[in-house]
Interface confidence: low
């Protein structure tokens, strides 16, 4: 079928269009083009006779048309009037007519649009703005862009006038943006330059910075005011309602208590005509006095006296704070604070309560500390200690004993021998001693302030012969692989050599054995069951020697992994099952059995008579050593076969 295709269909003014013919019949006489949807001689554009190749213009010929041998028609320099239908009339050689109609549309090339506005300075929350895209153009589509994005959906945005007008109702400062309009038709699209909407707003409620409202006398006051506003706000300051200055910042140096009051910042927008104010209350505090501590007892006695520390001066409506050793007060039943925190009472003072103590007065801006106070706690004397610790001496040596007892004030010392006063010194010295110097040596310490006395007695033996030593232990039942044991050879004697034997042999070399304290102490680290031996210590000097009785170390160990005997696991039905469990352990462990997880008896031997296949299963022996706190277990599978079905063993 004969058809006409317009290329392009939408044509811009001044361009050209080709009316292309498809399915042109064979054996043609000629063809003719007409403007419109039908053949009308008055509207003929051009005719063409194939035989003569002669083109004949018609009444509608404009001089811009070119006809091609394939019947296609090119129209150049298109004008608006060219829009419409075009009909091709084909006359075949048999003079049978055929017609086809095509069409195209002509659109103008659009000019660059511009935006007009009905309000160049709208006021926020009050005005509406109508943007209109110019010029008005027929058959054009209008589009709008905000910050190069398509329009958001909003009840405050309205398009009208064929989308040519964009109205923003109740403008806000957020509408301050770049607006563009665009015109489109099928042959062109043009975008306008940006129009920036200048929304007048504010001033908002101003903010005063900094936020702090409390100052000390003598500081500088520097307040700054800011309010969101377009155009920028003009600022005024008022103090207690009295105008001060028209600046954004207010500066008052070296303030006093008299500068306390209400400070108002007023922001004014001359374009919107609006004023907004913000008030802040400034309080200026005078410097408080430095506090100090008084005490009701300057020399309290340990465990007897209480001490009340008071923070001075007394000031109404003030918070008092306390520190001990530069830390806040610990929680203690011996520390009591009065209702106003001004008095700190130490009940039944101890020597550890010396301090230092500080109190503080808190005001709105800071805390003022007192100087530290240290308590002079009277204590002691504690039980004196006599050194050195030797109790055996050889004749002919010098005896020099020293006594010390913790005490405040320092203790006064006295020495007694067999109850007889000797001297009032801290040290006792006797040269070239003999057996007659053996006896009870007493040191007496006296605290003159508290009136308390304490004594310690030491037995001194002067003898050429050494006594029989003995072994003391710090752990009588050590646990294997866990504990250490320290054996000490007693007594401590001057100019004496200490020796050790294990099972009658001298000490083996071992990283687990360590001698210390002049060989007087033997330490066994990480004891094992093999350390359960006889230990003997000996002492000797140039005159005599002696050995202790043996001490046997009782090492607690185990339980080790138990062994179930006999080892058999297959039995014939009807046999007796007699299982015995053993585990190395000190002390002996407690035994218990489980069959298929079910607890049985607490015995070392499990006996079941005349077993059947029902006795198949897992037999578990559990061992527990209460002394070491350790447990162990083993599981054995037992299979019982019906008689004659397997050559199993019989118990």
């Amino acid at each position: 079928k004969l058809t006409i295709e317009s290329t392009p269909f939408n044509v811009a003014e001044g361009k050209e269009v080709l009316l292309l013919v498809h399915n042109l019949p064979q054996h043609l006489f000629g063809y003719s083009w007409y403007k419109g949807e039908r053949v009308d001689g008055n509207r003929q554009i051009i005719g063409y006779v194939i035989g003569t190749q002669q083109a004949t213009p018609g009444p509608a010929y404009s001089g811009r048309e070119i006809i091609y041998p394939n019947a296609s028609l090119l129209i150049q320099n298109i004008i608006q009037n060219d829009t419409g239908f075009y009909t091709l009339h084909v006359i075949k050689s048999d003079l049978v007519n055929e017609e086809a109609t095509g069409q195209f549309r002509v659109y103008p090339e659009l000019p660059k649009p511009s935006i007009s506005s009905n309000n160049s300075k709208p006021v926020e929350d009050k005005d509406a703005v109508a943007f209109t895209c110019e010029p008005e153009t027929q058959d054009a589509t209008y589009l709008w862009w905000v910050n190069n994005q398509s329009l958001p959906v909003s009840p405050r945005l309205q398009l009208s006038n064929g989308n040519r007008t964009l109205t923003l109702f109740n403008v806000t400062r957020n509408d301050t943006a770049s607006y563009k309009c665009e015109t489109q038709n099928p042959v062109s699209a043009r975008r306008s330059d940006s129009v920036i909407l200048n929304v007048l707003y504010g001033p908002d409620a101003p903010t005063i910075s900094p936020l702090n409202t409390s100052y000390r006398s003598g500081e500088n006051l520097n307040l700054s005011c800011h309010a969101a506003s377009n155009p920028p706000a003009q600022y005024s300051w008022f103090v207690n309602g009295t105008f001060q200055q028209s600046t954004q910042e207010l500066f008052i140096p070296n303030i006093t208590v008299n500068n306390s009051g209400s400070y108002t910042c007023q922001a004014h927008n001359s374009d919107t005509g609006l004023n907004r104010t913000t008030v802040t209350t400034i309080t200026v505090y005078a410097e408080p006095p430095k506090p100090f501590i008084t005490s009701n007892n300057s020399n309290p006695v340990e465990d007897e006296d209480a001490v009340a520390l008071t923070c001075e001066p007394e000031i109404q409506n003030t918070t008092y704070l306390w520190w001990v050793n530069n830390q806040s007060l610990p929680v203690s039943p011996r520390l009591q604070l009065s209702n106003d925190n001004r008095t700190l009472t130490l009940l039944s003072v101890t020597r550890n309560d010396v301090g230092p103590y500080e109190c503080g007065i808190q005001n709105e801006l800071s805390v003022d500390h007192s100087d530290p106070v240290i308590l002079n706690v009277l204590y002691g004397p504690d039980d004196p200690t006599i050194s050195p610790s030797y109790t055996y001496y050889r004749p002919g040596v010098n005896l020099s004993l020293s006594c010390h007892a913790a005490s405040n004030p320092p203790a006064q010392y006295s020495w007694l021998i067999d109850g007889n006063i000797q001297q009032h010194t801290q040290e006792l010295f006797i040269s070239n001693i003999t057996e007659k110097n053996s006896g009870l040596y007493t040191c007496q310490a006296n605290n003159s302030a508290s009136g308390h006395s304490r004594t310690t007695v030491k037995t001194i033996t002067v003898s050429a012969e050494l006594p029989k030593p003995s072994i003391s232990s710090n752990n009588s039942k050590p646990v294997e692989d866990k504990d250490a044991v320290a054996f000490t050879c007693e007594p401590e004697a001057q100019n004496t050599t200490y020796l050790w034997w294990v099972n009658g042999q001298s000490l083996p070399v071992s990283p687990r054995l360590q001698l210390s304290n002049g060989n007087r102490t033997l330490t066994l680290f990480n004891v094992t069951r093999n350390d359960a031996r006889a230990y003997v210590c000996g002492i000797q000097n140039s005159v005599s020697a002696n050995r202790s009785d043996p001490v046997t170390l009782d090492v607690l160990y185990g339980p080790d992994t138990p062994i179930i005997s006999p080892p058999d696991s297959s039995y014939l039905s009807g046999a007796n099952l007699n299982l015995s469990c053993h585990s190395a352990s000190n002390p002996s462990p407690q035994y218990s059995w489980r069959i298929n997880g079910i607890p049985q008896q607490h015995t070392q031997v499990l006996f079941i008579a005349k077993i059947t296949p029902n006795n198949n299963g897992t037999y578990a022996c559990f061992v527990s050593n209460l002394a070491t706190g350790r447990n162990n277990s083993i599981v054995k599978s037992i299979t019982v076969s019906a008689s004659g079905t397997s050559p199993g063993l019989s118990a």
Partner: antibody
Framework: EVQLVESGGGLVQPGGSLRLSCAAS????????MHWVRQAPGKGLEWVGR????????KYADSVKGRFTISADTSKNTAYLQMNSLRAEDTAVYYC??????????????WGQGTTVTVSS | EIVLTQSPATLSLSPGERATLSCRAG??????????LHWYQQKPGQAPRLLIY???NRATGIPARFSGSGSGTDFTLTISSLEPEDFAVYYC?????????FGQGTKLEIK
Amino acid sequence: EVQLVESGGGLVQPGGSLRLSCAASGFNIKDTYMHWVRQAPGKGLEWVGRIDPANGNSKYADSVKGRFTISADTSKNTAYLQMNSLRAEDTAVYYCAPFGYYVSDYAMAYWGQGTTVTVSS
Amino acid sequence: EIVLTQSPATLSLSPGERATLSCRAGESVDIFGVGFLHWYQQKPGQAPRLLIYRGSNRATGIPARFSGSGSGTDFTLTISSLEPEDFAVYYCQQTNEDPYTFGQGTKLEIK
């Protein structure tokens, strides 16, 4: 700061009624649409409906149309969801969310903590 | 009613990997060329949290590893490098026309 607090949830028998509240602060509900969204246990989110508090116009999901009514009290800055003829399938956590240019830029940027509605006999 | 289909239903990944979640609309959700499709994250016992609005805009306080793209009917949420706190359920929602609809959700779980 924008805040939404839903309340009024609880246990109700099938056929019963319940009224949920959504108290808003930090913005004016007149400037937005107020939506209700629900989430059944272990399921996804389902839009229930919305109201324009400025004029009272409301829209609903087909599943609740005729049974649920959304209203708003602009003086209290609060939206409500009146639920009648409740069914077991209405069991869910119910959320409210504002939607509009001023508050949430045309998405649900703010949600309440949700209130649980259980419909069971 | 515009139907939103999310895929996959479950996504198993490890921290540090890239996650790509898809949301397909039964018809275009564009208005003036802008996709009115949003992405939300929800963790157990919590309300949904807006991640991406109108296709590609990150909501306030959302880390830069979250991004959205797409227009018309096909939209994608991408998490460039997964953090432990990103494992949750993600929903898409269209607000182009009533009724506003949500996708059925994609569960992002730790592999």
